[in-house]
């Protein structure tokens, strides 16, 4: 019979609201009293096993403790009533646990989507946590219609899915209902139409046609989802080139109704553009669709818009009469091209004389001329057309070019190597740059480029190496032939020299010696060599410092002691720092010649 | 030359089927968008239906959904119509034509000879 | 769906006469416009596209003019081989594409 407890605390499952307060009493029974002599004063209260001071117990009767919480602030509270029995024992009568936590908060910012092709599904903020099982109810009626209610899993307590078919054109009211032990509370009641809350499915099946009579558009088809027939539609399409990461927009106002074709304007010719679509309600009520699958599509081939940069380089050594001249033309760039080149077209003309054609895959053509006056013309072919023609004059043999550009300055900046210069008084129609590294190692072999006559600053528009020398080259182009060409050397970044010069003496006295050096190899320079400085030291002495310009290859080291040993090394230095070379010693004679002792 | 030329016309009774065909020549039809456009006897012109260049797409006016189906085949440069649940009222000359677009518009050129089709009751 | 009304449905003129016929969409149709000649037994043949451009092979004397919803085909001296029925095409919001009713011009 003591299985049974000795009393019971009311009250039996409390649920709390935080930080309120909360009063239990534990009742003792008799025969637990008259057992274990004891009575109300005897009873000891504990919270998750700790005791709770008697000065929050109140004594109501015989057979009654109660012990008060205020600001109750833990979720979870075992509480224990217990007694003292013989000898200071503690025998434990019953238990219960506090729970506490919040009562819902009116629920807020409901809103509801109807995705095509499935039920309506409606969202909201519950509010701050309860930390309390909180129930919520999406309710939803027709005004002569209830229907069943929604009851959100508890894995997403902020969203639920109606079982019902969604009927446009009749409005709806929806409201959401959130219940706990502590309360119940009810979101303001929103009424609409279905019709408005329509996420359509994207259009699909969208494709890309091109036009062989205009190279800047593409025709966009597409198949509306099927929500078309129940609403109007509007729509947005984005597209980029192929290799681009941002979108551009067609303008709304330009997609504004219901459709199933868009021609798209204003692209590059035989360019690949992607594009994707989405779609919404034409009167913007509702959400937009997802974006549809993209498409890509490429722009008919138009004409090249430019002729290709063209120049020559005539052979020196020519035959009696005659000369190897070898024309030359970069490929244009795709937006220049607009299309696949087929082919190069180039004709020759011999002062006041007869035609030469050629066509030509390759973007070079070596010609035997005459020394005479020749004009070169050349058109890049694509499918759809020729560019305009390039024209060159190869003067005759006894032209005398003139007219350089002036104050030919080159510099890196912005990790590009940039070439300036003053322009001639003359009209210049074009300029050619070229530009090669200088090696003792290989021949300069020159790349190439051209530039409208107008410009004066450019950067070179090549691969170019770090530490490396350009020599650098411009050619104002007249009508009757090259000006004199001007010359400037520039690196893109300098570096430190990759060997320092190696010293030796030129001739050592008593008191001094000559010492000499070679320049650097070019491709050891890594830059413009500025200065070099010559260290040099006794074994037991300071070593002494003395900086040298850095066209000199010689230099006197005097107030030298006689009969020593000295250590001398010398390192050349860029802009970008300094390197040594090997370290070389002499010893200076005891004796000046013909000194005796 | 471009050239379009409809085939398969004839006297069908109500409810009964149809299968028209357009045999492209002269230009690449692969490329192009096509068109079926109808007019009955004395009256205006009517577009029927639509299919994109690589048959992904097709449109159709409201009075023949459900009925119609267009289709092409791009290796014979042939579009068709079939036509199901034919009724009186679709009784016409039935025009392929080829879609050319700009960016201002899309137009129907060239039409073919046209086909008759007449429902009978 | 856009409504494309042609006025008027028909008119009598003589040969060197000048002649305008009018088209209206009930929308706002850019320059998604074009014209049709259709003569009797014959199939429509292009004359203007996108509002204003004349197609290839058609005589000059055809022009076309208008944006939006306002838009004129003119005849600027009718020749004998001119009179035929004239039909107006918006391409502007398809499906579904839409016709006028025809114009049609008869010889005086």
């Known amino acids: 019979e003591l299985l049974d407890p000795c009393g019971y605390i009311s009250p039996e499952s409390p649920v709390v609201q935080l930080h309120s307060n909360f009063t239990a009493v534990c009742v003792l029974k008799e025969k637990c009293m008259d057992y274990f002599h004891v009575n109300a004063n005897y009873i000891v209260w504990k919270t998750n096993h700790f005791t709770i001071p008697k000065e929050q117990y109140t004594i109501i009767n015989r057979t009654a403790s109660s012990v008060t919480f205020t600001d109750i602030s833990s979720l979870n509270i075992q509480l224990t009533c217990n007694i003292l029995t013989f000898g200071q024992l503690e025998q434990n009568v019953y238990g219960i646990t506090i729970i506490s936590g919040l009562p819902p908060e009116k629920p807020k910012n409901l809103s509801c989507i109807v995705n095509e092709g499935k039920k309506m599904r409606c969202e909201w903020n519950r509010g701050r946590e309860t930390h309390l099982e909180t129930n919520f109810t999406l309710k939803s009626e027709w005004a002569t219609h209830k229907f069943a209610d929604c009851k959100a899993k508890r894995d997403t307590p902020t969203s639920c899915t109606v079982d019902y078919s969604t009927v446009y054109f009749v409005n709806i009211e929806v409201w959401v209902e959130a219940e706990n032990a502590l309360g119940k509370v009810t979101s303001d009641h929103i009424n609409f139409d279905p019709v408005y809350k329509v996420k359509p499915n994207p259009p699909h099946n969208l494709s890309v046609i091109n036009s062989e009579e205009l190279s800047s558009i593409l025709k966009l088809t597409w198949t509306n989802p099927s929500i078309k027939s129940v609403i109007r539609l509007k729509y947005n399409i984005q597209y980029r080139t192929k290799d681009a990461s941002t979108w551009s927009q067609i303008p709304p106002e330009d997609t504004a109704s219901t459709r199933s074709s868009f021609t798209v304007q204003d692209l590059k010719p035989f360019t690949e553009y992607v594009f994707r679509i989405c779609c919404m309600k034409e009167d913007g009520k509702g959400y937009w669709s997802d974006w549809s699958e993209e498409a890509n599509g490429i722009t008919y081939e138009d004409r090249p818009s430019k002729a290709p940069s063209f120049w020559y380089k005539i052979d020196p050594s020519h035959a009696q009469g005659y000369r190897t001249v070898q024309l030359m033309w970069k490929t244009l760039p795709p937006f220049e091209a607009n299309g696949k080149i087929l082919d190069y077209e180039v004709t020759l003309t011999r002062w006041k004389s007869h035609l030469q054609n050629y066509t030509v895959n390759d973007t070079k053509l070596t010609v035997n001329l005459t020394n005479d006056r020749y004009v070169a013309t050349l058109t890049a072919r694509n499918l759809v057309g020729k560019s305009d023609a390039a024209v060159l004059t190869i003067p005759a043999c006894d032209f005398q070019a003139t007219h350089p550009v002036m104050d030919l300055k080159a510099f890196p900046k912005d990790n590009m190597l940039w070439v300036e210069w003053t322009t001639p008084r003359e009209s210049v129609k074009k300029y050619i740059l070229e530009w090669c590294v200088l090696s003792d190692k290989a021949p300069c072999i020159a790349d190439w480029q051209q530039e409208d006559g107008t410009v004066h600053r450019t950067h070179l528009r090549g691969n170019l190496a770090e530490s490396k020398c350009y020599l650098i080259t411009v050619t104002p182009v007249y009508a009757d032939g090259p000006g004199s060409p001007e010359s400037i050397k520039a690196y893109l970044k300098q570096a430190p020299p990759s060997k320092g010069p190696t010293v030796r003496t030129k001739k050592v006295g008593k008191n001094e010696a000559v010492l000499e050096w070679d320049q650097l190899p070019v491709d050891v320079q890594n830059g413009f060599i500025r200065n070099y400085t010559i260290f040099y030291r006794t074994i037991i002495g300071n070593e002494t410092a003395v900086n040298v310009d850095s066209s000199h290859t010689e230099y006197t080291l005097s107030s030298l002691t006689s009969d020593t040993l000295y250590m001398v090394r010398m390192a050349a230095y860029t802009d970008e720092g300094g390197k040594d070379g090997p370290e070389f010693t002499f010893t200076t004679p005891k004796f000046a010649q013909g000194e005796i002792e | 030359e471009v050239q379009l030329v409809e085939s398969g016309g004839g006297l069908v009774q109500s409810g009964g089927s149809l299968r028209l065909s357009c045999a492209a020549s002269g230009f690449t039809f692969s490329r192009y968008e096509m068109n079926w456009v109808r007019q009955a006897p004395g009256k205006g012109l009517e577009w029927v239906a639509y299919?994109?260049?690589?048959?992904?797409?097709?449109d159709y006016s409201d009075s023949v959904k459900g009925r119609f189906t267009i289709s092409r085949d791009n290796a014979k440069n042939s579009l068709y119509l079939q036509m199901s649940s034919l009724r009186v009222e679709d009784t016409a000359v039935y025009y392929c034509?080829?879609?050319?677009?700009?960016?201002?518009?899309?137009?129907?050129?060239?039409w073919g000879q046209g086909t008759l089709v007449t429902v009978s009751s | 769906d856009i409504q494309m009304t042609q006025s008027p449905s028909s008119l009598s003129a003589s040969v060197g006469d000048r002649v305008t016929i009018t088209c209206r969409a009930s929308q706002s149709i850019s320059s998604y416009l074009n014209w049709y000649q259709q003569k009797p037994g014959k199939a429509p043949k292009l004359l203007i596209y996108a509002a204003s451009s004349l197609q290839s092979g058609v005589p000059s004397r055809f022009s076309g003019s208008g944006s939006g919803t306002d838009f004129t085909l003119t005849i600027s001296s009718l020749q004998p081989e001119d009179f035929a029925t004239y039909y107006c095409q918006q391409s502007y919001s398809t499906p579904p594409i839409t016709f006028g009713q025809g114009t049609r011009l008869e010889i005086k």
């Open positions: 299919i994109s260049n690589t048959g992904t797409t097709r």
């Open positions: 034509v080829r879609e050319k677009f700009s960016g201002t518009s899309d137009w129907f050129d060239p």
